[in-house]
């Protein structure tokens, strides 16, 4: 059994999250993960999910009663999601820590936007453009 | 030329982000993207970058002078990053909108944690466990 299981059960008790009523009104993450089988699609979703958990854990960093559980789970996330690669984890952490209200960060983000956009689709790297990548505009285009 | 280029140039003017001094003290996103060649690694990073831009654009949604530019860029992000797939974009949006301070959300997240963790590594789906997935702790362990 992976180390995180016991510690996650401990967190369930702490957050009173073991009751069946918690599952009312659908799931947060599991239903979404079920929708995506393609590895790169899953990574898009899991990236948001992992950053959510890291934020959640940060909010409880001063609560000693769950520190060991939180640390064990974070470590196992490092192992599983970042494949034990500290550089990958550090780069991810940098991205999640940028403040969207910081004026210098805003300027930098806009400065880099064209190059970021150019790299967004896998096709960008091969120079080929996917057939689906045309600009459709319509009633619900700007979401 | 993709539609976003002209509009991104417009945003550069608005944010005063065209000056060379903006690049001082390194990049936000470009340096990180350069580190990752593997598609699934890139998606992990790009997921955070795209959510950053969406948050940034949301903060300026009432500024009429840049609305057209913002909408065009968002559309092109939908096309490039979500491959024009509205469901993918909607699921992504749901994940980015969960509030980490909402008690019900916290309980649900902890309730789902074990299953989310079980799906985190690509190996999880095949039942194989990667050799590198071992738990080491050290000086800079709990970041």
């Amino acid at each position: 059994q992976d180390p995180y299981v016991k510690e996650a059960e401990n967190l369930k008790k702490y957050f009173n999250a073991g009751h069946s009523d918690v599952a009312d009104n659908g799931t947060l993450f599991l239903g979404i993960l079920k929708n995506w089988k393609e590895e790169s699609d899953r990574k898009i979703m899991q990236s948001q999910i992992v950053s959510f958990y890291f934020k959640l854990f940060k909010n409880f960093k001063d609560d000693q009663s769950i520190q060991k559980s939180v640390e064990t789970i974070k470590e196992d996330m490092n192992v599983k999601f970042f494949n034990s690669n500290k550089k990958k984890r550090d780069d991810f952490e940098k991205l999640t820590n940028y403040s969207v209200t910081d004026l210098n960060v805003q300027r930098k983000a806009i400065h880099e936007l064209i190059q970021v956009m150019a790299e967004l689709s896998p096709a960008a790297k091969t120079g080929k453009r996917k057939r689906s990548q045309m600009l459709f505009r319509g009633r619900r285009a700007s979401q | 030329q993709d539609p976003y280029v002209k509009e991104a140039e417009n945003l550069k003017k608005y944010f005063n982000a065209g000056h060379s001094d903006v690049a001082d003290n390194g990049t936000l996103f470009l340096g990180i993207l350069k580190n990752w060649k593997e598609e699934s690694d890139r998606k992990i990073m790009q997921s955070q970058i795209v959510s950053f831009y969406f948050k940034l654009f949301k903060n300026f949604k009432d500024d009429q002078s840049i609305q057209k530019s913002v909408e065009t860029i968002k559309e092109d992000m939908n096309v490039k990053f979500f491959n024009s797939n509205k469901k993918k974009r909607d699921d992504f949006e749901k994940l980015t909108n969960y509030s980490v301070t909402d008690l019900n959300v916290q309980r649900k997240a902890i309730h789902e944690l074990i299953q989310v963790m079980a799906e985190l590594s690509p190996a999880a789906k095949t039942g194989k466990r990667k050799r590198s997935q071992m738990l080491f702790r050290g000086r800079r362990a709990s970041q």
């Epitope: 180390p3 470590e75 490092n78 192992v79 494949n83 034990s84 690669n85 500290k86 550089k87 990958k88 550090d90 | 350069k34 580190n35 990752w36 060649k37 593997e38 690694d41 990667k130 050799r131 590198s132 071992m134 738990l135 080491f136 702790r137 050290g138 000086r139 800079r140 362990a141 970041q143």
Partner: antibody, heavy 120, light 113 residues
Framework: EVQLLESGGGLVQPGGSLRLSCAAS????????MSWVRQAPGKGLEWVSA????????YYADSVKGRFTISRDNSKNTLYLQMNSLRAEDTAVYYC?????????????WGRGTMVTVSS | NFMLTQPHSVSESPGKTVTISCTRS????????VHWYQQRPGSSPTTVIY?????PSGVPARFSGSIDSSSNSASLTISGLETDDEADYYC????????????FGGGTKLTVL
């Protein structure tokens, strides 16, 4: 002061066994992964094995897998390397090293090393 | 597993600048941190650069590390060379792609003329 002190090296015949120890002091031993790195005479560094802080996870280089066993006793602040079926190519200075960050990234503290000679 | 290749030896005069390269054979050099160790004759290795370009306290600013994706290599640069810098230098990275543990370069002997 943070210190690592290796012992247990010596001369052993091919096929023989030896147990190396590494006594740690000056830091919370159980909080750190530890590793063994060796250096053959006149040659470069070669990573041998590593163990997690709790001792629950171990890891080996292909060249020693099945012959060497890493272990630790956190109550004694000591790291061990049990070496069996020794070969001439295992002749080297064996360094005990502290792993500097989570997983196997860098080694921030090294011992002085203990010499192992495998010869008939 | 990938390999890390370093020049066998380099030499330079005191006060000058020297750069030691470390080239990764497969996979991207940028996808794992690179660390550098100094080993003086008869001594244990000590870290001079960790995580690509970070210096441990006590290591002078004359030592710097960098990564170049185009050549798939890392570099250790020592400026204002001192006779005391004469030593073997090793680069090291972790193989998390193929789960091969820790990889060291073959080492570079720096001679200060």
């Amino acid at each position: 002061e943070v210190q690592l002190l290796e012992s247990g090296g010596g001369l052993v015949q091919p096929g023989g066994s030896l147990r190396l120890s590494c006594a740690a002091s000056g830091f919370t031993f159980s909080s750190y992964a530890m590793s063994w790195v060796r250096q053959a005479p006149g040659k470069g560094l070669e990573w041998v094995s590593a163990i997690s802080g709790s001792g629950g996870s171990t890891y080996y280089a292909d060249s020693v897998k099945g012959r060497f066993t890493i272990s630790r006793d956190n109550s004694k602040n000591t790291l061990y390397l049990q070496m069996n079926s020794l070969r001439a190519e295992d002749t080297a200075v064996y360094y005990c090293a502290r792993v500097g960050s989570w997983y196997l990234e860098d080694f921030d503290i090294w011992g002085r090393g203990t010499m192992v000679t495998v010869s008939s | 597993n990938f390999m890390l290749t370093q020049p066998h030896s380099v030499s330079e005069s005191p006060g000058k600048t020297v750069t030691i390269s470390c080239t990764r054979s497969s996979g991207s050099i940028a996808s794992n941190y690179v660390h550098w160790y100094q080993q003086r004759p008869g001594s244990s290795p000590t870290t001079v650069i960790y995580e690509d370009n970070r210096r441990p306290s006590g290591v002078p600013a004359r030592f710097s590390g960098s990564i170049d994706s185009s050549s798939n290599s890392a570099s250790l640069t020592i400026s204002g060379l001192e006779t005391d810098d004469e030593a073997d230098y090793y680069c090291q990275s972790s193989d998390t792609t193929y789960h091969g543990g820790v990889v060291f370069g073959g080492g570079t002997k720096l001679t200060v003329l």
